[in-house]
């Protein structure tokens, strides 16, 4: 198994993957296979109302660049806790002995996996990205080497511009074949999106490819600068009883997903008032309604908040509210 894979993002469309060769390979490592797939955002993000008081905005950070060649495990790999980044303590004698035993066990276990679990598979020629990856069959052996990925379904908002749920994980996943090096720059990725990366070491560069159990690591690309900005005008409609319906377009390709909108409005000469519009409320009304407005000139600005933070405020939109008791009843309904 390739050791200590670390992945970092250096831009909104790239992830850099680095690893170390297996400690005790079976024969010569001829190449590595790197597969990646986009991860759906947690389904609770689509359901929770982040406008509720006391509900903290979800913390989603991208994978920061390397500090040095040896700063391993910047971002969590599967089953790791991401609670904090700490230095490793000096190893005790018992730990060193234990690691030597584990190294010996790993060698034996890899031999076992090679011979018992995996059936060698053929890969088609040509560029990896076009290869639909002929199925690498596994013989059933309980849960050995079996990693399950829970992909949340986004049932509540099927039509909003959010991260889509990937189709069957084994099908048509992009991959790269890496020869003579222990690093890869994965390009052409979506901004501020989590990716699950699978890395295998292979020791036979023939149609009967023999590859190790996969090592897994996760990373998130960096945010795109203006992706959370509301594009297009903020429009309004004035209804009876001085109700103003404000409407705007959801950012087309936000950083992750939009969790809420802030609406800031003020009557000329008065202090600014704020409304928080959740995903659900926006979806229901395509905006929000201001009710009980006193007559006068108003300005309104709106900004979106995504998993990566706030977008920019829109340019102010202006509207005038009349004293509806004094006007004929032909105001737009």
């Amino acid at each position: 198994v390739p050791l200590d894979p670390i992945s970092v993002s250096n831009s909104s469309s790239q992830i850099i993957l680095k690893w170390k060769p297996p400690s005790d390979p079976n024969g010569n490592i001829t190449h590595y296979l790197v597969f990646w797939e986009r991860q759906a955002e947690d389904s609770e993000l689509f359901e929770l109302d982040y406008c509720l008081k006391g509900l903290k905005l979800p913390s989603r950070t991208w994978s920061p660049p390397f500090e040095s060649e040896d700063s391993q495990k910047h971002n969590q790999s599967e089953y790791e806790d991401s609670a904090g980044e700490c230095c490793s303590c000096p190893k005790t004698d018992s730990q060193i002995l234990k690691e030597l035993e584990e190294s010996s066990f790993r060698k034996t276990f890899e031999d076992y996996l090679h011979n018992v679990v995996f059936v060698p598979r053929k890969t088609s020629s040509g560029t990896g990205a076009e290869d639909p990856r002929p199925s690498r069959k596994r013989r059933s052996l309980g849960d050995v080497g079996n990693v399950t990925v829970a992909v949340p379904t986004v049932a509540a908002f099927p039509n909003t511009s959010s991260t889509s749920v990937p189709t069957s994980p084994e099908e048509h996943r992009p991959f790269e074949k890496v020869v003579n090096k222990e690093s890869l720059v994965i390009s052409g990725l979506r901004h501020f999106t989590g990716y699950r990366i699978e890395l295998q070491a292979c020791n036979q560069d023939t149609p009967e490819e023999r590859c190790s159990v996969a090592a897994y690591v996760s990373a998130r690309t960096m945010p795109e600068a203006k992706a959370d900005d509301i594009v297009g005008p903020v429009t309004h409609e004035i209804f009876e009883n001085n109700v103003v319906h404000l409407m705007w377009q959801e950012p087309k390709e936000p950083n992750g997903l939009i969790v809420l909108y802030e609406v800031s409005y003020r009557r000329y000469g008065d202090e600014e008032l704020h409304l928080c519009v959740s995903r659900k409320h926006f979806a229901l009304e395509r905006g929000c309604r201001l009710r009980g407005l006193s007559p006068g000139n108003y300005s309104v600005r709106i900004r979106a908040t995504s998993l990566a933070g706030n977008g920019s405020w829109t340019e102010p939109t202006y509207f005038y509210v009349t004293d509806y008791l004094d006007v004929p009843s032909n105001i737009a309904k």
């Epitope: 509720l52 039509n159 409304l275 229901l284 395509r286």
Partner: antibody, heavy 118, light 112 residues
């Protein structure tokens, strides 16, 4: 003048289906989310379902999830509630109501009575 | 879901006298933007519900000034300064802060 008129209620046996309609007039129907709210005999009000202005987003009360379907036809200014697998506890007056975010429901229909009985 | 509890459930009042209905929520109704989405509805006998008050204390158009709403957080009150015959019916509080919207059980106001 805003008007909401429900139709389609009646007496139906348990397990059967019924479709309610709500005809809207006097406002731009396609700009508003719409709700169904029900009231069992002698009881309080219970929210049933809501549909967004375009019809693409729908939410249901747990008590009707999987059995009831809310839909709308903006070209006909009409809201619908398809009720399947009806139970005795679905017996109620069903109101359609216009949505105002946070402020609840600013206009209600007169209601249509659904009685589920064998 | 947020539970709304009203009291009293029955309120006999003499014409011209004041009346007060209490509504308590199981969670705070203050939204992140500091607005409180608590509404009051009136349902006269044989009629549909009608909204009287929105956002705790704002009267809907056409609602007589004898109706007033107050409160904050989890405790709210609807007051009628002088009850008139046309006020007979059931009054419901409803919260619009948390999803789904939920109603109180209703308070039946009747004339003594």
């Amino acid at each position: 003048e805003v008007q909401l008129v429900e139709t389609g209620g009646g007496v139906v046996q348990p397990g059967r289906s019924l479709r309610l309609s709500c005809a809207a007039s006097g406002f731009t129907f396609s700009s508003y989310a719409m709700h169904w709210v029900r009231q069992a005999p002698g009881k309080g009000l219970e929210w049933v379902a809501v549909i967004s202005y375009s019809g693409s987003n729908k939410y249901y009360a747990d008590s009707v999830k999987g059995r009831f379907t809310i839909s709308r036809d903006n070209s006909k200014n009409t809201l619908y509630l398809q009720m399947n697998s009806l139970r005795a506890e679905d017996t109620a007056v069903y109101y359609c109501a216009r949505h105002e975010w946070g402020f609840g429901f600013d206009y209600w229909g007169q209601g249509t009575t659904v009685t589920v009985s064998s | 879901d947020v539970v709304m509890t009203q009291s009293p459930l029955s309120l006999p009042v003499t014409l011209g006298q004041p009346a007060s209905i209490s509504c308590r929520s199981s969670e705070s109704l203050v939204y992140g933007d500091e607005n409180t989405y608590l509404n009051w509805f009136q349902q006269r006998p044989g009629q549909s519900p009608r909204r009287l008050i929105y956002k705790v204390s704002n009267r809907d158009s056409g609602v007589p000034s004898r109706f007033s709403g107050s409160g904050s957080g989890t405790d709210f009150t609807l007051k009628i300064s002088r009850v008139e015959a046309e006020d007979v019916g059931v009054y419901y509080c409803m919260q619009g802060t948390h999803w789904p919207y939920t109603f109180g059980q209703g308070t039946k106001l009747e004339i003594k």
